[in-house]
Interface confidence: low
């Protein structure tokens, strides 16, 4: 999905006002310390595509972060201030549904959901032009 | 008003290094990402690498590798590039620029460095 | 490196002519390209970002459109302090790059 049609600053506000509270609140208990970022992403739309990866996109270690609130959320966010982008995930929701229940939190995924949280942060001090 | 302004004209003997600066004005320094970009005489434009003031995070145009550093002070709102082991071939116009998405909305006036013996 | 092919690499054209340039990618860079406009002595203006959207202060005469691998660049009306040298850029990925540049001079 190309996200440069998307409206940022909505996403950042939806950010702000809540998936960001539940993305802490997935790492409570966890420094931001403990892991280093080692995903970047280069502008707005690239951090989208980074972030949207990381969320959806299940990893050997860390299956089902898709089935989180903050992802969930995410989702939402996505769905309604990017043209188009519901239509695109029909498919990738199908795919889901296939996915195991997470028994634990990992610290795989706690380390990709500190990853998570890097990318949005940087997503939005590339908006900070805007305040 | 947004300004990039570059440091004056350099002559450089073959071998020698140059240190090219941009002040930023107008906007939050940390905020962009600052570029340089390479325009030898007559030519086109050519992406050196670009800096990120706020956590001093580079990338390079692997061409450029060895030959570019990038600086920033962030205290003065000023970038750097110095360039070494200089030759004719980097005989060029050098304009940093920034960017919030990969496309370079402000740039400065640009820096001829010449190189000759 | 993603390759950026422009054409033609001159033109001559008329006050009022409707010119139009193409820039190509060598793979899929999705809308992340911009268009320059450069003219001698000078820096490079920014005038078009994420392939059709226009800078601020651009004249609506300039014009972006394409998208995956294949742009343009359509000034609509020839001004005469339109003679002057465009560039493309994407801006999908590191490192960015730009196309060789347009030359459209006075016919």
């Known amino acids: 999905y190309d996200f440069t049609n998307c409206d940022f600053q909505k996403i950042e506000a939806d950010y702000l006002r809540t998936i960001s509270k539940d993305l802490i609140t997935y790492m409570s208990g966890t420094k931001s310390t403990d892991f280093n970022n080692t995903v970047s992403c280069s502008n707005r739309p690239h951090c989208l595509t980074e972030i949207q990866s990381l969320t959806f996109n299940p990893t050997p270690r860390c299956a089902s972060l898709a089935k989180e609130m903050f992802a969930r959320k995410t989702k939402a966010t996505l769905a309604l201030w990017c043209p188009g982008y519901s239509e695109t995930q029909i498919n990738a929701t199908q795919a889901m549904k296939k996915r195991r229940k997470r028994k634990v939190t990992t610290n795989k995924c706690l380390e990709q959901v500190s990853q998570l949280l890097g990318l949005w942060r940087r997503f939005i001090r590339t908006l900070l032009k805007k305040q | 008003q947004v300004q990039l302004v570059q440091s004056g004209a350099e002559v450089k003997k073959p071998g020698a290094s140059v240190k090219v600066s941009c002040k930023a004005s107008g906007y939050t320094f940390t905020s962009y990402w600052m570029h340089w970009v390479k325009q030898a005489p007559g030519q086109g434009l050519e992406w050196i690498g670009v800096?990120?003031?706020?956590?001093?995070?580079?990338t390079y145009n692997q061409k450029f590798k060895g030959k570019a550093t990038l600086t920033v002070d962030t205290s003065t709102s000023t970038a750097y590039m110095e360039l070494s082991s200089l030759r004719s071939e980097d005989t060029a116009v050098y304009y940093c620029?920034?960017?919030?998405?990969?496309?370079?909305?402000?740039w400065g006036q640009g820096t001829l460095v010449t190189v000759s013996s | 490196d993603i390759q950026m092919t422009q054409s033609p690499s001159s033109l001559s054209a008329s006050v009022g002519d409707r010119v139009t340039i193409t820039c190509r990618a060598s793979?899929?860079?999705?809308?992340?390209l911009a268009w320059y406009q450069q003219k001698p002595g000078k820096s490079p203006k920014l005038l078009v970002y994420f392939a059709k959207t226009l800078a601020a202060g651009v004249p609506s005469r300039f014009s972006g459109s394409g998208s995956g691998t294949d742009f343009t660049l359509t000034i609509s009306s020839l001004q005469p302090e339109d003679f002057a040298t465009y560039y493309c850029q994407h801006h999908y990925d590191t490192p960015w790059t730009f196309g060789q540049g347009t030359k459209v001079e006075i016919k």
């Open positions: 800096i990120d003031p706020y956590d001093t995070d580079t």
């Open positions: 620029t920034r960017s919030l998405d990969g496309f370079f909305d402000y």
């Open positions: 793979e899929n860079i999705y809308s992340y």
